[in-house]
């Protein structure tokens, strides 16, 4: 069920996930000058049952110069606080992936972890793309990719995103759309999003305390 490959590389773009399907693994990577403690886990694993998903294992880094005398321990989520509002799900907002069964939230940071996280995704995972600073998006479709199983092999769908330098002219006149906008897609392709019109991540996330569906606070 693990995806054979990483999500597609789009020039001048990065991808991110909103939540992680059960079975996803996160490498325990440490920043330069630090390493995993000898008995430490190689990875964290998203596991769960029908009602709750969480990350197994802890990532722990220690200074490469020491011999495990000072262990930096992963901050543990003691309690997940959910702040629910009475607002109805907006048609402009996707169903919150992390509130669906079988998905884990973003693991909390740990001391001296590497800046970039390396995930190993499973079939059904969706990631969203965004052009990096200094580039703008030209779309012909969704700026997202899903790992699918086809004829016994896994593959990632191709995100319809081209990132062009700010000063360059549009390759597809009239085709420019807001960046990283999870757009409408057939039900058969994913049940994680409601059908939407074009909209920006800014409105899609509804991320303030006042408008969010819930916020998880890692203790």
């Amino acid at each position: 069920e693990l995806c054979d490959d990483d999500p597609p590389e789009i020039p001048h773009a990065t991808f991110k996930a909103m939540a992680y399907k059960e079975g996803t693994m996160l490498n325990c990577e440490c920043k330069r000058g630090f390493r995993r403690i000898k008995s430490g886990s190689l990875y964290m694993l998203c596991t769960g049952n029908s009602s709750h998903s969480s990350w197994d294992n802890q990532c722990q880094c220690t200074s490469s110069a020491t011999r495990n005398t000072t262990k930096q321990v992963t901050p543990q989520p003691e309690e997940q606080k959910e702040r629910k509002t009475t607002e109805m799900q907006s048609p402009m907002q996707p169903v919150d992936q992390a509130s669906l069964p079988g998905h884990c939230r973003e693991p909390p940071p740990w001391e001296n972890e590497a800046t970039e996280r390396i995930y190993h995704f499973v079939v059904g995972q969706m990631v969203y793309y965004q052009c990096v600073q200094g580039y703008r998006a030209l779309h012909r479709g969704p700026a997202e990719s899903v790992c699918k199983m086809t004829h016994g092999k896994t593959r990632w769908t191709q995100p319809q995103l081209i990132c062009t330098g700010e000063m360059e002219t549009s390759q597809f006149p009239g085709e420019e759309k807001p960046q990283a906008s999870p757009e409408g897609r057939p039900e058969s392709e994913t049940s994680c999003l409601v059908t939407t019109t074009d909209f920006q991540i800014q409105t899609e996330m509804a991320a303030t305390m006042e408008t969010s569906i819930f916020t998880t606070e890692y203790q």
Epitope: E106, E113, Q130, I201, M205, S212, T216
Partner: nanobody, 125 residues
């Protein structure tokens, strides 16, 4: 060009509240994790709180957990820090920071590539 501008600092009594804001521009705010750091007089800058790109997951320094709340409004390109039950040891300059393109959290200074100028918070006893 990326700009981060903090506001909302001031002089308050112990036990009071303050709400800091950080107005962001020059980048796609909704795509980045953000964080708050602070620097007390004569001390190094330290982590206070961080929030993921979606605005749904948060993490706090032990010293502020339960008293401070970080949030972000992706529609208004603004980061917030609600500070309740302030204590004298919360005094310092508070900075907002933008996480690097591929960083999940703005947890360490290494995770961040842009910083605001800071806003002074002074808590008197």
């Amino acid at each position: 060009q990326v700009q981060l501008q903090e506001s909302g600092g001031g002089l308050v009594q112990a036990g009071d509240s303050l709400r800091l804001s950080c107005a962001a521009s020059g980048f796609n705010f909704g795509w980045h994790a953000m964080g708050w750091f602070r620097q007390a007089p004569g001390k190094e800058r330290e982590f206070v709180a961080t929030i993921t790109w979606t605005g749904r997951d948060t993490y706090y320094a032990d010293s502020v957990r339960g008293r401070f709340t970080i949030s972000k409004d992706n529609a208004k390109d603004t980061l917030f820090l609600q500070m309740n039950s302030l204590r004298p040891d919360d005094t310092g300059v508070y900075y907002c920071a933008k996480a690097r393109e591929r960083a999940t959290w703005a947890y360490s200074e290494d995770d961040c590539d842009y910083w605001g100028q800071g806003t002074q918070v002074t808590v008197s006893s």
